[in-house]
């Protein structure tokens, strides 16, 4: 807490300028009027204050706006934003995308801080949904943002926003998140032609069901192995050898290198060895000829 002392003669600040960097903390407290600070916040970020001094300026703003800062002040916080706590930010009502961008810029190049996470949460809740412009902005600053959301939060993403998503934005998404995003992507890209559609939908295929993979296998898409390895195991298992061959095209040869890894390993175990042999890749572990395949789930239902 800065001690309260009278402002020394001749030191009362008439404007927010660089002379203030030479003030001691108590002088800033005593000589800078909070209302003046609020109206000239746009100058603060250009002045080389220490964070120690910015703490004093924050204290003055807190006294002026105990219920939370107005957006006109928030927009110009600059590095003062780094001194805010999540509790401070929860009092704000940020509606402008420009304000959001200005504050994200301060944290650019660093991992998402609790302050930034709170700011984004407030902003998105205020908007009611993750619209395209917001998503565009957030993924530009934080490529992993989308994958930090819960499936419930992702359900509020409108299909139109999916156009803003880049492949790298989905790198850290787990299957539960892709399960939510895939149907939205399918809807968003539904009017595109075959090859263009596949380029766009490819990153989301970790959420695709079997019937969609079967449909893709009829379109000469030549899926790469990296994409295939991210598919849901339960969606891959029912695919026939012929369907996988069509789905992967020339990349089918890559199955050999992945035969011990999911979902390839589990898929091999479900195929007839005869069928696997037709690929000429030396894949082993299929069902030997003459063996009967029982569907245990069906058997349980009968007993």
């Amino acid at each position: 807490e800065v001690e309260k002392t009278a402002c020394p003669s001749g030191k009362k600040a008439r404007e927010i300028d660089e002379s203030l960097i030479f003030y001691k903390k108590w002088e800033l407290e005593a000589c800078v009027d909070a209302a003046l600070l609020a109206t000239q916040m746009d100058r603060v970020n250009a002045i080389p204050f220490t964070y120690e001094q910015l703490d004093v300026l924050k204290h003055k703003l807190d006294e002026l706006y105990p219920q939370g800062y107005p957006e006109s002040v928030i927009q110009h916080l600059g590095y003062l934003f780094l001194k805010m706590s999540p509790e401070d930010i929860r009092k704000w009502n940020v509606t402008s995308l420009e304000t959001l961008k200005a504050l994200l810029e301060v944290n650019k190049g660093h991992e998402m801080s609790p302050q930034v996470a709170t700011l984004i949460d407030r902003f998105v809740k205020g908007r009611g949904q993750l619209d395209k412009d917001t998503l565009d902005t957030l993924t530009a600053f934080y490529p992993g943002y989308l994958c930090s959301l819960s499936p419930e939060e992702l359900s509020s993403v409108p299909p139109s926003s999916i156009w803003a998503v880049r492949p790298q934005d989905l790198d850290t998404c787990d299957p539960r998140q892709l399960d939510v995003l895939y149907p939205k992507a399918r809807l968003a890209f539904q009017n595109m032609n075959g090859s263009e559609y596949f380029v766009k939908i490819q990153s989301f295929l970790g959420g695709a069901p079997t019937e969609d993979l079967k449909a893709l296998s009829q379109q000469n898409v030549s899926m790469d192995l990296a994409t295939f390895m991210k598919l849901r195991t339960d969606a891959v298992l029912p695919l026939t050898v012929a369907e996988v061959q069509k789905l992967l095209g020339p990349h089918v040869e890559g199955l050999k290198a992945e035969e011990r890894h999911r979902p390839v390993r589990d898929w091999i175990l479900r195929q007839r060895q005869d069928d696997l042999d037709t690929l000429g890749l030396g894949l082993q572990g299929g069902i030997p000829n003459g063996y009967l395949v029982l569907d245990l789930s069906m058997q349980e239902a009968l007993s």
Partner: nanobody, 116 residues
Framework: QVQLVESGGGVVQPGGSLRLSCATS????????MGWFRQAPGEQRELVAR???????MYADSVKGRFTISRDNSKNTVLLQMNSLKPEDTAVYYC??????????WGQGTQVTVSS
């Protein structure tokens, strides 16, 4: 984390000179350049001089024309040349900077005493 080490302090008579040096242990990424600060007993720390990232220099009114701040990038040092020293310049002098994450960094300080 980069270390800041000040040296060059001492006891000097009024009107005398001292040259303070601040060595950094590596490259610093500063939001506001490097500053020389001082703290007299019972007082709060105050900025004396600052050199910004673009080389611009700034001085407190009380030291203008007497103190000169400069930097030697090849040696990762920031210097403060203090001339015409006065008793009121007596203090512990610190170099410091602010990073881009919300933290100020200071050296351990070097004592300057101006006394006859």
């Amino acid at each position: 984390q980069v270390q800041l080490v000040e040296s060059g302090g001492g006891v000097v008579q009024p009107g005398g000179s001292l040259r303070l040096s601040c060595a950094t242990s590596g490259t610093i990424f500063s939001r506001n350049g490097m500053g020389w600060f001082r703290q007299a007993p019972g007082e709060q720390r105050e900025l004396v001089a600052r050199i910004l990232n673009d080389g611009t220099t700034m001085y407190a009114d009380s030291v203008k024309g007497r103190f000169t701040i400069s930097r030697d990038n090849s040696k990762n040092t920031v210097l403060l040349q203090m001339n015409s020293l006065k008793p009121e310049d007596t203090a512990v002098y610190y170099c410091g900077y602010s990073d881009y994450r919300g933290t100020d960094y200071w050296g351990q300080g070097t004592q300057v005493t101006v006394s006859s």
